[in-house]
C-alpha cells in the first residue's frame, strides 16, 4: 500500500504590476498530477508582510491571487498543494511548502523619506495630501506622488502639487471616480542631486479620512416652557444625512457648558425660565455606518439667543 504524495506548486512568485502595493501571487500546477486527473486540486496560500505576526490564509482552486501589501516592508508567502480526501480514499494529502519573498530594493537612508504624511478627503469630494520633506534633505530635493486604486489602468502622478520654497509638499487630487470603499495606494518618491531619497508607501480607504463641512442653518425653537429644540442642516455636498454624527457644544449664560453627540439634526435641551443667553455650535463627522473612521469638521458658526423670551422668537441664521 504505497503512500500517496503530491508535489508543491511550480513557479510560485509574487509579481508587482506597478500598482504601489497591490500585488499578484501566482503559480503553476505541480508536476506529476497525471494520477489525479479526476481530482480537483486545491492550493493553500499563506502570506503576510514581513514583521506581521499573523498569516493570511486562502484556499483556492485558482492559479493566482491578488491582495494589497505595505511596500515599506517585505512580503513573504508560501503555498502548498492539497489533495482532498475524495481523491486519496482517506485523509487529505498536502505537499511540502513552496516559498517566495518580495521586497522593493530600497535606496536612501530612512530619514530622507517624507515626514508627517497627512491625507484628508474634504467633504467626500476633494482629496488633499500634504507632507514635510525628509530630515536633512536639501532644497534641491523634490518629491513626487503617485497613486492607484482599482479602476485605474495604471498608477498616476499628481498633476497639481502644493509647493513651498520650490519644493513639492502636497498634492491636490483631481476628481476620483468610484474611488471609495476600496484600497487607495500612494507612493511618494523623490530625487536630489545631493543624495538618494527613500520612497514611502501609504494605503488607506477614502471614506475613512473624510472631513465634512460644518453643519449650517442653526436654529432654536421653543418646544415647551422648559425645552428648546436646537436644529441644523446637513452641509452641502454628497454625504447623505444617514452618514453623519454630530457633536454639539452648548453654552448657557456663559457658565454651563453642555457637550453631546447625536445622530440626528436636532437636539432637545432642558432649560429654565431664567435662561438669559443660549449659544451653540455643531460639528459633523462621518459615522460608523458609512466608514470605519473619520475627521471632525470645523465647528459651525455660533448661533446665539440673547435678551428675548425664547418662546416669542425662533432664530434663524
Amino acid at each position: 500500500d504505497t503512500e500517496i504524495k503530491v508535489n508543491p506548486p511550480q513557479d510560485f512568485e509574487i509579481v508587482d504590476p506597478g500598482y504601489l502595493g497591490y500585488l499578484y501571487l501566482q503559480w503553476q500546477p505541480p508536476l506529476s498530477l497525471d494520477h489525479f486527473k479526476e481530482c480537483t486540486v486545491e492550493y493553500e496560500l499563506k502570506y503576510r508582510n514581513i514583521g506581521s505576526e499573523t498569516w493570511k490564509t486562502i484556499i483556492t482552486k485558482n492559479l493566482h491571487y491578488k491582495d494589497g501589501f505595505d511596500l515599506n516592508k517585505g512580503i513573504e508567502a508560501k503555498i502548498h498543494t492539497l489533495l482532498p480526501w475524495q481523491c486519496t480514499n482517506g485523509s487529505e494529502v498536502q505537499s511540502s511548502w513552496a516559498e517566495t519573498t518580495y521586497w522593493i530594493s530600497p535606496q536612501g537612508i530612512p530619514e530622507t523619506k517624507v515626514q508627517d504624511m497627512d491625507c484628508v478627503y474634504y467633504n467626500w469630494q476633494y482629496l488633499l495630501c500634504s507632507w514635510k520633506p525628509g530630515i536633512g534633505v536639501l532644497l534641491d530635493t523634490n518629491y513626487n506622488l503617485f497613486y492607484w486604486y482599482e479602476g485605474l489602468d495604471h498608477a498616476l502622478q499628481c498633476v497639481d502639487y502644493i509647493k513651498a520654497d520650490g519644493q513639492n509638499i502636497g498634492c491636490r487630487f483631481p476628481y476620483l471616480e468610484a474611488s471609495d470603499y476600496k484600497d487607495f495606494y500612494i507612493c511618494v518618491n523623490g530625487s536630489s542631486e545631493n543624495k538618494p531619497i527613500r520612497s514611502s508607501y501609504f494605503t488607506f480607504q477614502l471614506q475613512n479620512i473624510v472631513k465634512p463641512l460644518p453643519p449650517v442653518y442653526l436654529t432654536f425653537t421653543r418646544e415647551s416652557s422648559c425645552e428648546i429644540k436646537l436644529k441644523w442642516s446637513i452641509p452641502l455636498g454628497p454625504i447623505p444625512a444617514r452618514c453623519f454624527d454630530y457633536e454639539i457644544e452648548i453654552r448657557e449664560d456663559d457658565t454651563t457648558l453642555v457637550t453631546a453627540t447625536v445622530e440626528n439634526e436636532t437636539y432637545t435641551l432642558k432649560t429654565t425660565n431664567e435662561t438669559r443667553q443660549l449659544c451653540f455650535v455643531v460639528r459633523s463627522k462621518v459615522n460608523i455606518y458609512c466608514s470605519d473612521d473619520g475627521i471632525w469638521s470645523e465647528w459651525s458658526d455660533k448661533q446665539c439667543w440673547e435678551g428675548e423670551d425664547l418662546s416669542k422668537k425662533t432664530l434663524l441664521r
Epitope: 514581513i50 514583521g51 516592508k73 517585505g74 521586497w103 530594493s105 530600497p106 535606496q107 536612501g108 537612508i109 530612512p110 530619514e111 530622507t112 530630515i135 536633512g136 543624495k195 538618494p196
Partner: antibody, heavy 116, light 108 residues
Amino acid sequence: EVQLVESGGGLVQPGGSLRLSCAASGFSLTKYGVHWVRQAPGKGLEWVGVKWAGGSTDYNSALMSRFTISKDNAKNSLYLQMNSLRAEDTAVYYCARDHRDAMDYWGQGTLVTVSS
Amino acid sequence: DIQMTQSPSSLSASVGDRVTITCTASLSVSSTYLHWYQQKPGSSPKLWIYSTSNLASGVPSRFSGSGSGTSFTLTISSLQPEDFATYYCHQYHRSPLTFGGGTKVEIK
C-alpha cells in the same frame, strides 16, 4: 550561501590611494545594497557609505570627498576607492549586505595600514 | 550626527549572571532602525538583534532587546561562555549611520 569577501588591503603611504574590492556571492547586487564599514585597531565601528541596489550611493559626509564607492553588477562586486589616505584611515574595512535596513552579513575584512 | 553612547564600556561577569547593556542616542531613533551586533576578537561583527527587539537567526533566546526613543537595552538573562564578546548598538535612522562605542563583556 551568502558570502562577502574583501580584498585589496595593504600598506600604503600617507597621501596615497588604494582600491578595495568586495566580491559578493549567494545574492545579487541588483537586489541588495552593500555597505562599507571600517574599524580602527582596538576601536569601534564607523560607517563609510553604501551602494544601493539601484546604483545610487550614500556616504558618511566626513569621508565623502576622499572615498568613492562603485560596483560592477556583472561581476557582482563592490569597490571602495580611497584617495589622499591619512594615518587615521588605518583600519580593517568590512563590506556588509543591507537587508531590511540592517547589515545582516559581513565579510571577514581587509586591513589597510597607512604609514610612512 | 546621532551619537550613540554605550554603558558600561566594559564589564566583568560570571557565567549565569544577568547582564544589561544600555545604549543612549543623542536624538530620538525609531525602534525599527536600532540594531545590536556581536563581535568576537579576530572576527567580523554579526547582526544579533534587529529593530530593537528581534533576535537574528541563530541567536539564543536568553538575549533580549528593548527600548524606544533615545534609550535602548540589550539583556542577557543568563550569561554563557560563548556570550563573551563586544556588543555594539547601531542606528540606521539618520545619516551618517552610527554605532555605539561598544561594550566588552569579559569573564570575571
